[in-house]
C-alpha cells in the first residue's frame, strides 16, 4: 500500500467518512502510522 503523506491523509479521510467521524481526536494524519490502516 502507498505510504506517502498524501496517501495516508486520503486513506484516513476515507476511514473518517465511513465511520461518520466517530473516531478518537488524535486520529489525524500526522499521528497515525500505516499500521493504523
Amino acid at each position: 500500500a502507498c505510504d506517502t503523506a498524501t496517501c495516508v491523509t486520503h486513506r484516513l479521510a476515507g476511514l473518517l467518512s465511513r465511520s461518520g467521524g466517530v473516531v478518537k481526536n488524535n486520529f489525524v494524519p500526522t499521528n497515525v502510522g500505516s499500521k493504523a490502516f
Epitope: 502507498c2 506517502t4 503523506a5 489525524v28 494524519p29 500526522t30
Partner: antibody
Framework: EVQLVQSGAEVKKPGASVKVSCKAS????????MNWVRQAPGQRLEWMGV????????TYNRKFKGRVTITVDKSASTAYMELSSLRSEDTAVYYC????????????WGQGTTVTVSS | DIQMTQSPSSLSASVGDRVTITCKAS??????VAWYQQKPGKSPKALIY???YRYSGVPSRFSGSGSGTDFTLTISSLQPEDVATYHC?????????FGQGTKLEIK
Amino acid sequence: EVQLVQSGAEVKKPGASVKVSCKASGYTFTDYYMNWVRQAPGQRLEWMGVINPYSGRTTYNRKFKGRVTITVDKSASTAYMELSSLRSEDTAVYYCASLLIRPHYFDYWGQGTTVTVSS
Amino acid sequence: DIQMTQSPSSLSASVGDRVTITCKASQNVGTNVAWYQQKPGKSPKALIYSASYRYSGVPSRFSGSGSGTDFTLTISSLQPEDVATYHCQQYNFYPYTFGQGTKLEIK
C-alpha cells in the same frame, strides 16, 4: 477560514541561502503534513519535500542533494523552507501546500513566494 | 523517479466543447493521481484526487479517470473560466512528480 500565508519576494545572489515562511491558520497545524513545491519560469511544478509538523520528520526530493531544509515552529503554526547554495536555476515561485481533512477536505496552497537568484 | 507525461502541451477549444487531457506515468501508480488547475499568476487549485474523486466545490463538469499508468481529466462542457494550465501529479511514490502542464485556451 483556512489560510497559508507566505513571506514576501526575495532577491538573492548566487551561493546565498533563502528561507521562506508559511504561516498556517484556520486549522490545527500539527495535524496535517506540509509540502513545499516550486515552479521555475516555463517549467513544470517540482515537489521539494514534506514535513510532519507533529514529529518534525521530513522527506526530501533527492534532486536537491541536501540543499533544502524544511522546519516548523509549532508555537507559531509556521513552516519554513530553506534552500542553500542558490544558483540561477533556483529562480522560481515557491509554494507551501497542505492537504486537510478538517475543517474541509481540500488541498490548500499558499499564495507563492517569488525567489530571484541573480548576480 | 516517476515520469508524468501530459498531452497535449496546449490546446484550443470552443465554449461548450468536451475537452480531454491525458497523463501517462512511467510506472504503475495505482489511482494515486491528482489534477490541478492553475490560472496565470495564481497558485494551483486542486480539482481531483485519487484519479477520479472531485473535491467539494469543484464543478461537476470536471471528471477524472484512470488507473495504473494512464489517466484522463475531462471537462464535459468547456466554460470561459476554465482557461488555465492543468497539471497532473502522482503521489504514490516519493518524490511526488508532476506532468509538464497543459495550457487550455478558448477558440
